[in-house]
């Protein structure tokens, strides 16, 4: 109507999807009687009657709002339940008397989108792409109104930048009226972006104010050419023969290039390619001194066939050569002297030690061992150990056996053996001397002889226990060019009272052994007299 005052701005009512909107008719008593009101929805400038109030009683009109409207607050407020995005429109109430006035309410509807779903480019991005390449996508589902997306790199928001950063977004309306926002970040990346963290953020509004949701952070596979190639050796530090050594070729490109490792040949002055495993690693196991030398790595870009060469790396596999001892097989008379000399080569300074084989006692620190006034007991093993003190575990040894000339020397002079009549007895007798003695027995039986070492012999006799044998006992005699010596084994019948409580009669009585080693090595439990210390 010309001259009529401009309509006031509608009252704003904000509500979340699914909740109830309370539409309060703001007509004053002078503007109309609230017991007689018509409610309309306005959509695309078209009014539709949705609710009538008569004498304070409400009545829904047929249509989309029929089931969702009710009166509250003594008829002054219309409640709209289960609000949907389609309800975002103007509602107006119109009083009937004294003259027709209306009050307008703008309903604004909100819904937080779901957590943003970020997906990174699974194939990666080369740094030399001609234009911005797709880095990641972000999807925010079921929000209202359309949320805003912001992309971040390392915590900083990304802005559109010509030929560098491009953000492309679109939205679709679901059947529910909610929006799904889709966004793709395109960017030209550089090598430094290989560790960059990207994420997307959705900004949206609710009746309570502005809010945001962030996606998880992702990193993008970034491909960049190799600029530098180098070799790494494991283990680090001093290497020694016998170690497992890995020579690995490394490059700063992604994906790694194809590698080959070569070793310089000092005689031909040419590099010879080494055989690497599937990962391009050269494994030396066990490492030998021949593996020492100059290694280098060549990296090939199979796309461009450009190759890069690493700095050469010297590999030193430390070693100790075979140890030589002179004299190699020493023989001496009792009372004489002997000088043993030890030699070896190494890539490092060597230390020598002489040890007695039987006791591991250190006799000398140095390559020369001098022995004076040699006794029979001096016969046996001497070990020279050549070691590199700076490299634990790098050592070699050589054993030399010293023989002292002398007549046979018995392990025992006499011994008592408990037996049972008619049992088969296993007797043993041990003697040493140089030259090596032979052993004979004074009774018939099955004898077998075995060398313990070049100067020592052990003879075993299987014999049936007879009354005559019990009476005479058994003698073993050892002889060599320098003399002879005898041991006597006295046989004594066992009875139950002579057996110890822990005896095992079956084994004890069937395999009696008359050897000085019985205590340590035999399962025999026959009782023995204490061993005499005399050595004949």
């Amino acid at each position: 109507v010309p001259g009529e005052a401009e309509q006031p701005a509608p009252e704003l009512v904000e509500v979340e999807v699914g909740s109830t909107a309370l539409l309060k008719c703001g007509l004053s008593q002078s503007q109309g009687n609230l017991s007689h009101v018509d409610w309309f929805s306005v959509h695309k400038e078209k009014r539709t009657l949705i609710f009538r109030v008569r004498q304070g009683q409400g009545q829904s009109e047929p249509g989309e709002y029929e089931q969702r409207l009710s009166l509250q607050d003594r008829g002054a407020t219309l409640a709209l339940t289960q609000v949907t995005p389609q309800d975002e429109r103007i509602f107006l109430c119109q009083g009937k008397r004294p003259r027709s006035q209306e009050y307008r309410i703008q309903l604004r509807v909100y819904k937080a989108p779901e957590e943003p779903n970020i997906q990174v480019n699974p194939l990666g991005i080369p740094v030399n792409s001609k234009e911005p390449e797709e880095v990641a996508t972000c999807v925010g589902r079921n929000g209202y109104p359309i949320p805003q997306v912001i992309w971040y790199k390392n915590g900083r928001p990304l802005k559109e930048e010509k030929n560098r950063v491009h953000i492309q977004s679109s939205q679709t309306v679901e059947s529910s009226g909610l929006y799904t926002l889709q966004s793709i970040l395109k960017a030209q990346l550089v090598k430094e972006d290989k560790d960059a963290q990207f994420y997307c953020e959705l900004n949206y509004r609710l009746p309570s104010g502005n809010h945001m949701k962030e996606s998880r952070e992702v990193t993008v596979p970034v491909f960049y050419p190799t600029e530098k190639v180098w070799l790494e050796v494991e283990p680090v530090g001093m290497l020694k023969e016998g170690d497992r050594v890995e020579i690995r070729c490394l490059a700063d490109g992604n994906p790694p290039p194809h590698f080959s490792i070569s070793k310089g040949n000092p005689s031909t002055r040419e590099a010879e390619e080494e055989t690497t495993n599937d990962n391009g690693v050269l494994v030396l196991e066990p490492a030998r001194k021949e593996h020492s030398g100059r290694y280098e790595c060549q990296a090939w870009n199979l796309d461009t066939m450009i190759s890069l060469l690493s700095e050469p790396q010297e590999l030193l596999v430390n070693y100790v050569s075979d140890v030589r001892v002179s004299p190699a097989a020493p023989e001496r008379q009792e009372g004489s002297s002997l000088t043993l000399t030890c030699e070896a080569e190494s890539s490092q300074d060597l230390e020598f030690q002489w040890l007695r084989e039987e006791t591991d006692q250190v006799l000398e620190r140095g390559p020369v061992l001098q022995l004076h006034d040699l006794k029979r007991e001096a016969g046996g093993g001497y070990r020279c150990v050549a070691s590199v003190p700076s490299i634990p575990g790098l050592n070699r040894t050589q054993l030399v056996k010293l023989a002292i000339f002398g007549p046979p020397w018995m392990a025992f002079k006499e011994r008592k053996v408990w037996v049972k009549e008619n049992m088969v007895l296993n007797l043993s007798c041990e003697a040493s001397g140089h030259p090596r003695p032979t052993i004979s027995w004074n009774v018939n039986g099955t004898a077998s002889e075995g060398d313990q070492d070049p100067q020592r012999v052990l003879s075993t006799l299987n014999v049936l226990v007879t009354p005559e044998l019990l009476e005479t006992g058994v003698e073993c005699t050892a002889s060599n060019d320098l003399g002879k010596n005898t041991s006597i084994l006295f046989l004594e019948l066992v009875n139950l009272t002579t057996l110890t409580p822990d005896s095992n009669t079956t084994t004890g009585l069937s395999t009696s052994t008359a050897s000085p080693h019985t205590r340590a090595n035999s399962t025999s439990t026959e009782r023995k007299l204490p061993e005499p210390e005399s050595r004949g």
Epitope: V120, L123, S129, E133, E134, T137
Partner: antibody, heavy 118, light 106 residues
């Protein structure tokens, strides 16, 4: 509507080179990437190669040295070449469009069966 | 490379049945997973993307769930046209497909 159609030889000899063409319509190769996926008879799907909307090429490392993928945006075509063909390469070869806002394949060609035999 | 293992490799069911197909990734792929349906002599058709989003035009009886390494495709009430082979595919690092699950009529 979006369509993709594969074309190329149905039979190739061992050691020969296979060239397949994917002709697309209903979208632009500068807005969607295209992949090649193959399926040997009675077996599973296997991704071979891709070209992005920006023109970047990607290959399955199992075949990389034998593959080449390229495109002609004016003809709306993507071309795959695979050298040194072997009977184990006998398969149905599909081209597929990558969804613009995701990394899955939303449209596929009907596929072309390539047999490698002497 | 990420391996995708589907189970079962085949299953028999009747119209109206509720069916689940499982897919296991050899490492965490978050929700970078799609499900495809393939009928004999036809190209695959995407059903589900981002592990649980239904592709436009796909009936709501299809649903996807899971995250990380374990994923499931569920068909709530089998229809005659659903008998086919189903593949899962990861797109977290490169592209790899499961070996397929053949769904047959009992």
């Amino acid at each position: 509507q979006v369509t993709l159609k594969e074309s190329g030889p149905v039979l190739v000899k061992p050691t020969e080179t296979l060239t397949l063409t994917c002709t697309v319509s209903g979208f632009s190769l500068t807005s969607n990437g295209v992949s090649w996926v193959r399926q040997p008879p009675g077996k599973a799907l296997e991704w071979i190669a891709a070209i992005s909307s920006g023109g970047t090429t990607y290959y399955n490392s199992a075949f990389k040295s034998r593959l080449s993928i390229s495109r002609d945006t004016s003809k709306s075509q993507v071309v795959l070449t695979m050298t040194n063909m072997d009977p184990v390469d006998t398969a149905t070869y599909y081209c597929a469009r990558r969804y613009g806002y995701g990394w899955y394949f939303d449209f596929w060609g009907q596929g072309t069966l390539v047999t490698v035999s002497s | 490379d990420i391996q995708m293992t589907q189970s079962p490799s085949s299953l028999s069911a009747s119209v109206g049945d509720r069916v689940t197909i499982n897919c296991k990734a050899s490492q965490n792929i978050y929700n970078s997973l799609a499900w495809y349906q393939q009928k004999p002599g036809k190209a695959p058709k995407v059903l589900i993307f981002n592990a649980n989003s239904l592709q436009t035009g796909i009936p709501s009886r299809f649903s996807g769930s899971g995250s990380g390494t374990d994923f499931t495709l569920t068909i709530s009430s089998l229809q005659p046209e659903d008998f086919a082979t189903y593949y899962c595919q990861q797109f977290y690092s490169g592209y790899t497909f499961g070996q397929g699950t053949k769904l047959e009529i009992k």
